[in-house]
């Protein structure tokens, strides 16, 4: 058993048939000693008397908020949550597995530059009694400083029969040094409460292993004299790291008729403008990638050809 | 050329050979982003190898104020990961095709550093740790791991010279 | 054609040693390995160790405890396989085989003993 | 050392029906999560071993009703439809950890 936060305590059992469970010993928190009753969850029912109340946690029967009393006034309370483990796994029932890019991986995260925030989201298919707290730091032994925000529900979407709700958090390396090549990767704790279970889930990756460049903007097309041949120019993204000279993209320009099936042609180059034909109908898309490290590609921006 | 004594790089050189070393460092092994290299009874293996760190100058504001500090932290590295590359590590079993990207990965990294150091000049070098490692299975291990970090330190090292061609160069 | 001749039947007193060759033909002998396997009558298949000429590197069973050496000759392209301080539990066919161990992107770990010699029969009695 | 244990010792099938042999390693034998380091030979009497299954990929040459899975520690060669060619001793291998070790062998004949 240990602390999570102040009055919340998560047992960690063995879960299979007829498991024995965990001996836990909760003590009142109060200097009364004598005439001391306990209670669990909105039950008058009284499990035990004095300052300390012994139970056998098994099950999530056994889980929930204790209550000491004396004489009709509450003294303290101490909830207990379920951190279920089988077959020497902890469980994983609260979050989804977004099998991307491996399986396994419930939380993700993604940084738009070398600035040291970055944003993780994981998906549940909950709606309700259900808690998240996200820590992070750079580094796990020697920890150096991230800030979170509150994770927020971000997204809801219906998947079939089911309902499907997206959180996600934002974070910030205190003093991220965007420069430099990163030794120790961030590591990612949330913890996720869902009625009496208690889930933790981690991540651990270097930022330049999660960057993914907001699009280009600002995407114009120039038609050139007597021929079919357009000059497509952009910019790099807003939120791009800066000098462009130091933090350079490189891009992948794409002519894209109306058919999914027709060829697309491709271009790729370290500048911001190139000459592409541009057939009817076709439409025009640029999208971004670090230069020198294949992090993720941006989505695209597109225009249409006419 | 860089010389210890303070003389600048041939820039936009090092820029064009640091960009085909990020080139190669990819791939040479493009899957190795993909692959689960926490595999049981695997210590930390690639502590030592050099990191390019918040104080070695390698930031733009850095190198404007003096880019020595940084070229020569650039060149340890690539003297390092040189000799790494030269090693048993990837010479032995499993061996690597006569084609594999490694073998040009190794002569770039020779030849940057060359570049930014000729002969006669002589900045210390840091030490490769003796990886000699027992099991096949481990040196593979070995070899996903350095490529992993030497993807990180080409690309730091590609920004540099990008940066310093574009705004350093006289 | 890949072949690998090895030398003929030898039979060898207690404590005595052997030294068994297997010659290849018909690729680069330096960037394949030979590895050596042995058979005991009616049992089952026993790695002994493999050499590769390429890398120099030599990996053994030290089941064998330093009896066996493995050599390889680049000139004649031929491996040996020396076993000393014999005993009646040596008697075996002894067998090299052509070993590819390679790593490429698609088989980071492509192990293949692709090509046998006929075998040597060595059999220890006083 | 990695043990390998092979089951059945030996297994007697009827022409055209399946076979199955399973290697159990005594640690695990994939790197990585799932490259595999584990092979099969096939042995006939009076012959030097044959390469049949490398990792996770068929022999060139190797008909196609042979077939390997398994991953971690255990592992299986089957053929789908025996003939009479398959009659032989199969033996797994293992080359994760020198020393690389085979496992007993399973004697395949016809019932």
């Known amino acids: 058993i240990w602390e999570l936060k102040k009055d919340v305590y998560v047992v960690e059992l063995d879960w299979y048939p007829d498991a024995p469970g965990e001996m836990v010993v909760l003590t009142c928190d109060t200097p009364e000693e004598d005439g001391i009753t306990w209670t669990l969850d909105q039950s008058s029912e009284v499990l035990g008397s004095g300052k300390t109340l012994t139970i056998q946690v098994k099950e999530f029967g056994d889980a929930g908020q204790y209550t000491c009393h004396k004489g009709g006034e509450v003294l303290s309370h101490s909830l207990l949550l379920l951190h279920k483990k089988e077959d020497g796994i902890w469980s994983t029932d609260i979050l989804k597995d977004q099998k991307e890019p491996k399986n396994k991986t419930f939380l993700r995260c993604e940084a738009k530059n070398y600035s040291g925030r970055f944003t993780c989201w994981w998906l549940t298919t909950i709606s309700t009694d259900l808690t998240f707290s996200v820590k992070s730091s750079r580094g796990s032994s020697d920890p150096q400083g991230v800030t979170c925000g509150a994770a927020t529900l971000s997204a809801e979407r219906v998947r079939g029969d089911n309902k499907e709700y997206e959180y996600s958090v934002e974070c910030q390396e205190d003093s991220a040094c965007p420069a430099a090549e990163e030794s120790l990767p961030i590591e990612v704790m949330v913890d996720a409460v869902h009625k009496l279970k208690y889930e933790n889930y981690t991540s651990s990756f270097f930022i330049r292993d999660i960057i993914k460049p907001d699009p280009p903007k600002n995407l114009q097309l120039k038609p050139l004299k007597n021929s079919r041949q357009v000059e497509v120019s952009w910019e790099y993204p807003d939120t791009w790291s800066t000098p462009h000279s130091y933090f350079s993209l490189t891009f992948c320009v794409q002519v894209q008729g109306k058919s999914k099936r027709e060829k697309k042609d491709r271009v790729f180059t370290d500048k911001t403008s190139a000459t592409v034909i541009c057939r009817k109908n076709a439409s025009i898309s640029v999208r971004a990638q670090d230069r020198y490290y294949s992090s993720s590609w941006s989505e695209w921006a597109s225009v249409p050809c006419s | 050329r860089a010389v210890p004594g303070g003389s600048s790089p041939a820039w936009t050189q090092c820029q064009q050979l640091s960009q085909k070393l990020c080139t190669l460092a990819w791939s040479a092994h493009p899957l190795v982003g993909h692959m689960d290299l926490r595999e049981e009874g695997d210590e930390e293996t690639t502590n030592d190898v050099p990191h390019i760190q918040c104080g070695d100058g390698c930031d733009p504001q850095g190198l404007r104020d003096n880019s020595q500090f940084c070229l020569q932290r650039i060149h340890q590295g690539l003297i390092f990961y040189e000799k790494l590359l030269g090693s048993d590590i990837f010479t032995g079993e499993p061996s690597l095709l006569p084609d594999s990207p490694v073998g040009q990965l190794h002569a770039s990294l020779l030849g940057l550093s060359q570049l930014l150091q000729p002969e006669g000049h002589h900045w210390e070098t840091q030490q490769i740790p003796s990886l000699s490692p027992s099991q096949p299975w481990q040196r593979l291990l070995l070899r996903f791991k350095i490529l992993r970090s030497l993807q990180a330190f080409v690309a730091v090292a590609a920004r540099v010279f990008a940066h310093g061609a574009a705004t350093l160069s006289p | 054609q890949v072949q690998l001749v090895q030398s003929g039947a030898e039979v060898k007193k207690p404590g005595s040693s052997v030294k068994v060759s297997c010659k290849a033909s018909g690729y680069t002998f330096a960037s394949y390995g030979i590895t050596w396997v042995r058979q005991a009558p009616g049992q089952g298949l026993e790695w002994m160790g493999e050499?590769?000429?390429?890398?120099?590197?030599?990996y053994y069973n030290e089941k064998f405890k330093g009896r066996v050496t493995i050599t390889a000759d680049k000139s004649t392209s031929t491996a040996y396989m020396e076993l000393s301080s014999l005993r009646s539990e040596d008697t075996a066919v002894y067998y090299c085989?052509?070993?590819?161990?390679?790593?490429?992107?698609?088989?980071?770990?492509?192990?293949?003993?692709?090509?046998w010699g006929q075998g040597t029969l060595v059999t220890v009695s006083s | 050392d990695i043990v390998m244990t092979q089951s059945p010792d030996s297994l007697a099938v009827s022409l055209g029906e399946r076979a199955t042999i399973n290697c159990k390693a005594s640690?695990?034998?994939?790197?990585?999560?799932?490259?595999?380091?584990l092979h099969w030979y096939q042995q006939k009497p009076g012959q030097p071993p044959k390469l049949i299954y490398n990792g996770a990929k068929l022999e060139s040459g190797v008909p196609d009703r042979f077939s390997g899975s398994g991953s971690g520690t255990d592992f299986t060669l089957t053929i789908s439809s025996l003939q009479a060619e398959d009659v032989a001793v199969y033996y797994c291998?293992?080359?994760?950890?020198?020393?690389?070790?085979f496992g007993g062998g399973t004697k395949v004949e016809i019932k």
């Open positions: 085989a052509r070993a590819e161990f390679i790593s490429t992107v698609v088989a980071p770990y492509y192990y293949a003993l692709d090509y």
């Open positions: 291998l293992q080359n994760k950890e020198v020393p690389y070790t």
């Open positions: 050499n590769y000429p390429r890398s120099g590197n030599t």
């Open positions: 640690k695990k034998v994939t790197i990585f999560g799932s490259t595999s380091a």
